[in-house]
Amino acid sequence: DAHKSEVAHRFKDLGEENFKALVLIAFAQYLQQCPFEDHVKLVNEVTEFAKTCVADESAENCDKSLHTLFGDKLCTVATLRETYGEMADCCAKQEPERNECFLQHKDDNPNLPRLVRPEVDVMCTAFHDNEETFLKKYLYEIARRHPYFYAPELLFFAKRYKAAFTECCQAADKAACLLPKLDELRDEGKASSAKQRLKCASLQKFGERAFKAWAVARLSQRFPKAEFAEVSKLVTDLTKVHTECCHGDLLECADDRADLAKYICENQDSISSKLKECCEKPLLEKSHCIAEVENDEMPADLPSLAADFVESKDVCKNYAEAKDVFLGMFLYEYARRHPDYSVVLLLRLAKTYETTLEKCCAAADPHECYAKVFDEFKPLVEEPQNLIKQNCELFEQLGEYKFQNALLVRYTKKVPQVSTPTLVEVSRNLGKVGSKCCKHPEAKRMPCAEDYLSVVLNQLCVLHEKTPVSDRVTKCCTESLVNRRPCFSALEVDETYVPKEFNAETFTFHADICTLSEKERQIKKQTALVELVKHKPKATKEQLKAVMDDFAAFVEKCCKADDKETCFAEEGKKLVAASQAALGL
């Protein structure tokens, strides 16, 4: 349905409030260093222009594409070259190359200060003084730090953020009310950002087919009662939504997501029995709820898969007629029967099936050739099962912090060239799989754990891509999306690594560590642990554990001392000397 004015169309569909919020998110995700006030000014100018187009779709420039309008606006920023360097060269290009250029300059790890949470009273005053600016600032700060954050979902987070302040700033104990809510939003926001980053990486690095395969598997697990045709329609629509959001087309994305939620709710009888509650909610909550909805019950008496996909004489005929449709059906049928498998495992099975058919359908006796294809699945299924069992046992034995430390050592030895902050961040997140998934019964552990690990390893991949330092990381990240986790799991100690020069400054600590939160203190210790492994990759687990215990004793002692700074200086030297002598640093 072609519209004379795309900007007018989206303004009318979304409404002024959502339009302005989405344009702000789009601009902040592109120009991550620009001050808040500059973005607000640009958004207001775009909004005023959109209103003129709503009034008269034939008005000047109203027929231009959104990329042209937004790109032209971004290119008016005076300090573009001095702030962004070569990104300014994008402005010399024409659409669609200009937008592609902006997309390529999105920075997953922008050099921005950490967001420090002000005192509750200060936040409540700011909220009451100017609610609109306060909420816009939230969108801006999240969007510029998370340039791939799923924009319509960020609107949902902003709605919850507003609700938290509305409720808690009137409460008797504001802090007790507000802080847990803000913590929850922060943690959920980081998780949401990372999940969306994987979707965008799938689309951008591995293409639409890879994303569609992922979506078929996930939606078939979630909606096992839905027909294949229904799942295929949902996959097509969902792919369009995410392609748009990952491509910076946030207005179209939000509009299409709303349409998809509407369609799902209008057709829930043929999709899932679990959607009723979601579909009674307002739009933003509804879309979020659908995205998180639990798996529906599997239909009773599903026939064996072997009949259609192994025993049938028509396997090669059906495959040859429409390869992707047939593989899609295989994936749908397998996934709806296996909510206990991770999506990536299901995709590995589908890939194995595809490879077998490619080989066997060209053979003299195809049926004889592919008859045992399901036997090839067994080791693929057992590998993640065994890994999860071992790691959950280790997690239960060690607890989260020490489990993270075990992973820090493991991953630093695998890829010691990776920067210490990245190793700490990624290993800490890998370690959270324990608390997140090990509590689940067997049937839910693998989808929880392996699909979560895919999200975390994608963080490693996107951070490493910005500054590549390890061929092994590049190889695991680029060869196969679904085999990233097995690829990293299979890496052994990097024997080619030349240990890092010892630098006493790395192991110098100050009294400020005593006032840090427990989390920040853990990060300091884990940073030291990574550096220790980089200096001494051959150190045993026991030696590293003992040195870390010495470090804990040193911090504990000095934080109790009267003259903390002197204690850190003197005892720190002793600690470094003792560790050097014992480990031969």
Epitope: Q543, A546, D549, D550, A553, A577, A578, A581, A582
Partner: nanobody, 124 residues
Framework: QLQLVESGGGLVQAGDSLRLSCAAS????????MGWFRQAPGKELEFVAR????????YYADSVKGRFTASRDNAKSTVYLQMNSLKPEDTAVYYC?????????????????WGQGTQVTVSS
């Protein structure tokens, strides 16, 4: 499991010296820090000294600093506490303990395996 056996306690005059030993058998000795604690009659268990896994790093309670020296010999799976310039207030049962996997380094709760203790009495 780890067995720890202290020896070397006794009755001495104020100003004298004693050397306590703690011999370990069982679980790996050299992987963990060792601690010395003491308990005077009617008092709480009190931290005295910690010697790290390699024997190169020691921490002491303020009350014994400069007078006591903790050391270890990993080849012999033994930890020592050399006590000089003893005072009557040093009278207590002395225990050696092996560090656990968590908890404070200066608190009994952070130590997993314990000896049976050896009595030290300092008369004035």
């Amino acid at each position: 499991q780890l067995q720890l056996v202290e020896s070397g306690g006794g009755l001495v005059q104020a100003g004298d010296s004693l050397r306590l030993s703690c011999a370990a058998s069982g679980r790996t000795f050299s992987d963990y820090a060792m601690g010395w604690f003491r308990q005077a009659p009617g008092k709480e268990l009190e931290f005295v000294a910690r010697v790290n896994w390699s024997g190169l790093l020691t921490y002491y309670a303020d009350s014994v600093k400069g007078r006591f020296t903790a050391s270890r010999d990993n080849a012999k799976s033994t930890v020592y506490l050399q006590m000089n310039s003893l005072k009557p207030e040093d009278t207590a049962v002395y225990y050696c303990a092996q560090r656990g996997d968590s908890g404070s380094n200066f608190d009994p709760s952070g130590y997993r395996y314990w000896g049976q203790g050896t009595q030290v009495t300092v008369s004035s």
